[in-house]
């Protein structure tokens, strides 16, 4: 059997196989050692007994999408049946005091591979034997502690495979420079040691995406905005836009990145090299936000131009191509020497990313201030608590609720939170009355809210002792 017979139904075309060469990967035309690595079809009854105590689940994730030319990393994590885990030696053990359907196990081991390898590897001290090999016959790499790695992972995509020895979790990175744009399928088959052979325990597949568009995401934050995820913001308060470029392999680390903003409110284009920008909308309504990100990234060098006409003189070698914009044709140099590549020459290509959002601008509470605090005189001579009136003003829309969070003087340990609907006139002046149990210094956070906004103000308040001889006073 060949690898492609074992690993997947997806058969890429000859063109795909030729143009998607992955560095360090091998062709799935290679032979598969079925004696050491048996192959079971889906639904084969042997899967049921491939692992003691249940089935192992493999979870495959990637940091897709990947900008073409960058690295994409795949991670496989094995999830064992309940109460099982991998120990420091790579053996699979039962967790202490954990009950599964079979109850508590007397034997601490599910698989004691350390014992197996000591029994089975009596081969002249080289640590190499005919069974310490991958499915294509290549020997296992002898990293320190390799004997504690008891799982064999075979990754398969684009007509190629990659073999890796590992523990219950492995990562593989692939450079996407030669990968065709669009969605691709990665399949992983996992085997475990079984004496002098291997047993399949899990198969998993996942789609990853390679793109020539910079993956861009924008977070938007605005003070007093009640819900930052609903793309509704407040008039007359700045919104902070923060551009996040999905570049987990840091492919664009050394690129100059330009951000071109159109806020959709007839304020024109704004170009910046900073990933954050502030913008204030001064009108209510719906606006179309557009961002274009441009980065000069390492990319393929352009094809050489047509051969020169013999009549022309030869220019010097000094001119070498350094930069190439995907939106412009290649240079029209006509000397064959001019484009003979200097080894490892870095060509650059402009990559673009786009983000578009429709945002709604509405009225909101812009500001809230406590303008006065008054100790309310109680009708009883020795009250246990103090009533404090906070006179509050606000700007913007009419609030519908008020919340007070009373905490310790550091404003960290909340003592109580009280929220209630509030009736405010168009002047936005209201009095909030709150109870304080006992004298001392308190931190008061007061928020006014409506459907779209939440405005906060804070103050420290000193509640005096209730000595009948001492006058009532307020200290702020």
């Amino acid at each position: 059997k060949r690898f492609h017979d074992v690993l997947g139904n997806e058969r890429p075309s000859a063109y795909m196989r030729e143009h998607n060469q992955l560095n360090g990967w091998s062709s799935d035309e290679n032979d598969w050692n079925e004696k050491l690595y048996p192959v079971w079809k889906r639904g084969d009854m042997r899967w049921k007994n491939s692992w003691k105590g249940g089935r192992v689940q493999a979870v495959l994730t990637s940091d897709s999408p990947a900008l073409v030319g960058s690295n994409i990393t795949f991670a496989v994590n094995l999830i064992f049946p309940r109460c099982q885990k991998e120990d420091a030696n790579g053996n699979i053990v039962y967790e202490k005091n954990c009950r599964n359907e079979a109850g508590l196990s007397a034997d601490p081991y599910v698989y004691n591979w350390t014992a197996w390898s000591e029994d089975s590897d009596g081969e002249n001290g080289t640590g190499q034997s005919h069974h310490n090999v991958f499915p294509d016959g290549k020997p296992f790499p002898h990293h320190p502690g390799w004997r504690r790695w008891n799982f064999i992972y075979v990754f398969h995509t684009l007509g190629q495979y990659f073999q890796k020895l590992g523990r219950c979790s492995v990562r593989v990175s692939v450079n996407t420079a030669n990968v065709t744009l669009g969605p691709q399928l990665m399949e992983v088959t996992v085997y475990r040691r079984h004496g002098r052979a291997y047993v399949p325990i899990a198969q998993v597949k996942d789609v990853y995406v390679v793109t020539d568009q910079i993956p861009v995401f924008v977070t938007m934050f605005q003070k007093n905005d009640r819900n930052s995820s609903d793309e509704t913001f407040l008039k007359d308060l700045p919104i902070m836009f923060d551009v996040l470029i999905h570049d987990p392999s840091h492919f664009l680390n050394y690129s100059t990145i330009n951000y071109k903003w159109s806020f959709g409110d007839n304020t024109g284009l704004f170009v910046s090299t900073n990933h954050t920008v502030n913008h204030t909308y001064v009108l209510n309504g719906t606006f179309s936000l557009n961002l274009t990100v441009k980065a000069a990234a390492p990319g393929p060098c352009p094809p050489p131009p047509p051969p020169p006409r013999p009549s022309k003189p030869t220019p010097s070698l000094a001119t070498t191509l350094k930069s190439y914009d995907s939106n412009t044709p290649g240079p029209a140099g006509d000397n064959p020497l001019e484009l003979s590549r200097i080894p490892d020459e870095n060509c650059q290509i402009n990559r673009y990313g786009h983000f578009q959002a429709t945002i709604t601008i509405v009225e909101g509470i812009l500001e809230v201030n406590i303008i006065q605090m008054t100790d309310v005189l109680m009708p009883v001579p020795w009250p246990e608590s103090s009533l404090i009136d906070f006179v509050v003003t606000c700007q913007g829309s009419i609030p519908t609720e008020v919340c007070t969070i009373i905490s310790d003087p550091t404003c960290e340990i909340t003592q109580n939170t009280v929220c209630s609907p509030v009736d405010v006139d168009e002047m936005c002046l209201l009095t909030v009355r709150r109870t304080f149990n006992g004298s001392g210094t308190y931190c008061v956070n007061l928020t006014l809210g409506d459907d779209t906004s939440l405005a906060l103000t804070s103050t420290l308040i000193s509640v005096p002792d209730r000595d009948p001889a001492s006058p009532l006073r307020m200290a702020n």
Partner: antibody, heavy 116, light 110 residues
Framework: EVQLLESGGGLVQPGGSLRLSCAAS????????MSWVRQAPGKGLEWVSS????????YYADSVKGRFTISRDNSKNTLYLQMNSLRAEDTAVYYC?????????WGQGTLVTVSS | QSVLTQPPSASGTPGQRVTISCSGS????????VSWYQQLPGTAPKLLIY???QRPSGVPDRFSGSKSGTSASLAISGLRSEDEADYYC???????????FGGGTKLTVL
């Protein structure tokens, strides 16, 4: 002068529906929260529901949650209470009241009788 | 069973001063304004006191409200026959997220 006028009450069978209206005048309706309060025959006052000036915030008593819906049309200066899955214990005079942290003006009420 | 507790009845003779109590908790009376409502027989309720002790215009100064901790009181001085009515206290309850009323006190002028 502030005026609140309820309508839409009447006799309805258990499980039935009714929609109450409250026409408001004499103040800026769109700037005020509004509420519904009911009073069963011979019993005390029970708050039913409240709505903010814009209609974005709504509160309901546990006894009516999921069955009653409060709404408003600021262009018509009208408050509504849609009552579904009515029960015998919903029988009461329903008052429309201005504001929600205190009820400073009340309508005269409309009687809702739920009976088979 | 009402969240706010009022005595079911109170009485007094004309000219006398009567007090109606209303007891609650920190989530209602303790941290929110108390209102008092008067309901004359066969009519809609009317706001008598708001913000613990404030009187709306048109309400005689014979009516006064006060609050201490988690209790509130309505005092009526110079009692008159026309004060015979049901009186309800009310406050927002921040734990229930609901407006709560007392069970009502029937005031009889003897």
């Amino acid at each position: 002068e502030v005026q609140l006028l309820e309508s839409g009450g009447g006799l309805v069978q258990p499980g039935g529906s009714l929609r109450l209206s409250c026409a408001a005048s004499g103040f800026t309706f769109a700037a005020r929260p509004m509420s519904w309060v009911r009073q069963a025959p011979g019993k005390g006052l029970e708050w039913v529901s409240s709505i903010s000036h814009s209609g974005g915030s709504k509160y309901y008593a546990d006894s009516v949650k999921g069955r009653f819906t409060i709404s408003r049309d600021n262009s018509k200066n009208t408050l509504y209470l849609q009552m579904n899955s009515l029960r015998a214990e919903d029988t009461a005079v329903y008052y429309c009241a201005r504001k929600w942290s205190t009820f400073d003006y009340w309508g005269q009420g409309t009687l809702v009788t739920v009976s088979s | 069973q009402s969240v706010l507790t009022q005595p079911p009845s109170a009485s007094g003779t004309p000219g006398q001063r009567v007090t109606i109590s209303c007891s609650g908790s920190s989530s209602n009376i303790g941290n929110n304004y108390v209102s008092w409502y008067q309901q004359l027989p066969g009519t809609a309720p009317k706001l008598l006191i708001y913000a613990d002790s404030q009187r709306p215009s048109g309400v005689p100064d014979r009516f006064s409200g006060s609050k201490s901790g988690t209790s509130a009181s309505l005092a009526i001085s110079g009692l008159r026959s026309e004060d015979e009515a049901d009186y309800y206290c009310g406050a927002w309850d921040s734990s229930l997220n609901a407006y709560v009323f007392g069970g009502g006190t029937k005031l009889t002028v003897l």
